[in-house]
């Protein structure tokens, strides 16, 4: 079926917004007022994946850019990156595994688990202005809980 997508922004549980930091990196920081316009708008696509009754597979693209969050091994460590794709072929229902995240909703908060690397999550640091990364721990110092705000297309 044609892939179903929605536009949204994400904030971590400390209310930090996500913004571009250079061409291929996201960082998390507190924004207010007009600065909120800096936050990235994601095109969240609902794709095939190891769907369960608790987990919904999604791909996270940057709206109107040919960039997708993907998970790859770098120096033997699961790593989050922004990957450039051919806009003629993406998004698609059958995304490669590295692009797929399991969206998990717990107590009105969202977690995004890598399909490629189970138990690794999109994470932010407690500190301001630090890169968004793939973290292998939940419930520790790093933040793995997010809220989603819908954006009209």
């Amino acid at each position: 079926a044609p892939v179903r997508s929605l536009n949204c922004t994400l904030r971590d549980s400390q209310q930090k917004s996500l913004v571009m930091s250079g061409p291929y990196e996201l960082k998390a920081l507190h924004l207010q007022g007009q600065d909120m316009e800096q936050q990235v708008v994601f095109s969240m696509s609902f794709v095939q994946g190891e769907e369960s009754n608790d987990k919904i597979p999604v791909a996270l693209g940057l709206k109107e850019k040919n960039l997708y969050l993907s998970c790859v091994l770098k120096d033997d460590k699961p790593t989050l990156q922004l990957e450039s794709v051919d806009p003629k072929n993406y998004p698609k229902k059958k995304m490669e595994k590295r692009f797929v995240f399991n969206k998990i909703e717990i107590n009105n908060k969202l977690e995004f688990e890598s399909a490629q690397f189970p138990n690794w999550y999109i994470s932010t640091s407690q500190a301001e202005n630090m890169p968004v990364f793939l973290g292998g721990t939940k419930g520790g110092q790093d933040i793995t809980d997010f809220t989603m705000q819908f954006v009209s297309s």
């Epitope: 079926a1 044609p2 994946g49 190891e50 769907e51 369960s52 987990k55 059958k94 595994k97 189970p118």
Partner: antibody
Framework: EVQLQESGPGLVKPSETLSLTCTVS????????VSWIRQPPGKGLEWIGL???????YYNSPLKSRLTISKDNSKSQVSLKLSSVTAADTAVYYC????????????????WGQGTLVTVSS | DIQMTQSPSSLSASVGDRVTITCQAS??????MNWYQQKPGKAPKLLIS???TLRPGVPSRFSGSGSGTDFTFTISSLQPEDFATYYC?????????FGQGTKLEIK
């Protein structure tokens, strides 16, 4: 060679729990999902649910409240438990291997067990 | 959930006949259509996946076509061993859903 074999009691009393085991060979349960499907006598096929390599499960809505699918990777076994059974649960129960081909055919089922008939009757 | 409407529910034909079975999905499923053959007392056997891809070892008289919502399964020249029940299955999204089945009988 990929093989799946269902086993369990052929007769279950109403209101009791139906328990079946699917023993697999030729593939690893940590790499491939396994579905359960049932077929009432003389009727069509109904997909029940599945367990993925990760251990996550997806249960079909009509049975969700009564269904538990679990597995033991080391024993190469998947189990199905269906509680509070009635005569309507009488069927041949099959387990089948998911294809798990990311970006190609993730949800299709390629190999099936031979099935086991479960009759619900007092 | 995606509904699959399969027709006909039964079909009488003779050896050598060309036989066609159709399946219609309630929404677009791209090419995520599978066709199974089931003989009495046996498990279903996968013949065709991804709408038209013949499984290894399956005779070339079996074929499938279609995409989106409308799909066709064809046996070009019926053989005695082909008399069985055939089911379509959509594998686009969970829950997986089957067609009602087509029983192919000897005329």
């Amino acid at each position: 060679e990929v093989q799946l074999q269902e086993s369990g009691p052929g007769l279950v009393k109403p209101s009791e729990t139906l328990s079946l085991t699917c023993t697999v060979s030729g593939f690893s349960l940590s790499d491939f999902g396994v579905s359960w499907i049932r077929q009432p006598p003389g009727k069509g096929l109904e997909w029940i649910g599945l367990i993925w390599g990760s251990g996550d499960t997806y249960y079909n809505s009509p049975l969700k409240s009564r269904l538990t699918i679990s597995k033991d990777n080391s024993k190469s076994q998947v189990s199905l438990k269906l509680s509070s059974v009635t005569a309507a649960d009488t069927a041949v129960y099959y387990c089948a291997k998911q294809r798990n081909l990311w970006g190609f055919d993730l949800y299709g089922m390629d190999y099936w067990g031979q099935g086991t008939l479960v009759t619900v009757s007092s | 959930d995606i509904q699959m409407t399969q027709s006909p529910s039964s079909l009488s034909a003779s050896v050598g006949d060309r036989v066609t079975i159709t399946c219609q999905a309630s929404q677009d499923i791209d090419d995520d259509m599978n066709w199974y053959q089931q003989k009495p007392g046996k498990a279903p056997k996968l013949l065709i996946s991804l709408a038209s891809t013949l499984r290894p070892g399956v005779p070339s008289r079996f074929s499938g076509s279609g995409s989106g919502t409308d799909f066709t399964f064809t046996i070009s020249s019926l053989q005695p061993e082909d008399f069985a029940t055939y089911y379509c299955l959509q594998s686009d999204s969970l829950p997986l859903t089957f067609g009602q089945g087509t029983k192919l009988e000897i005329k």
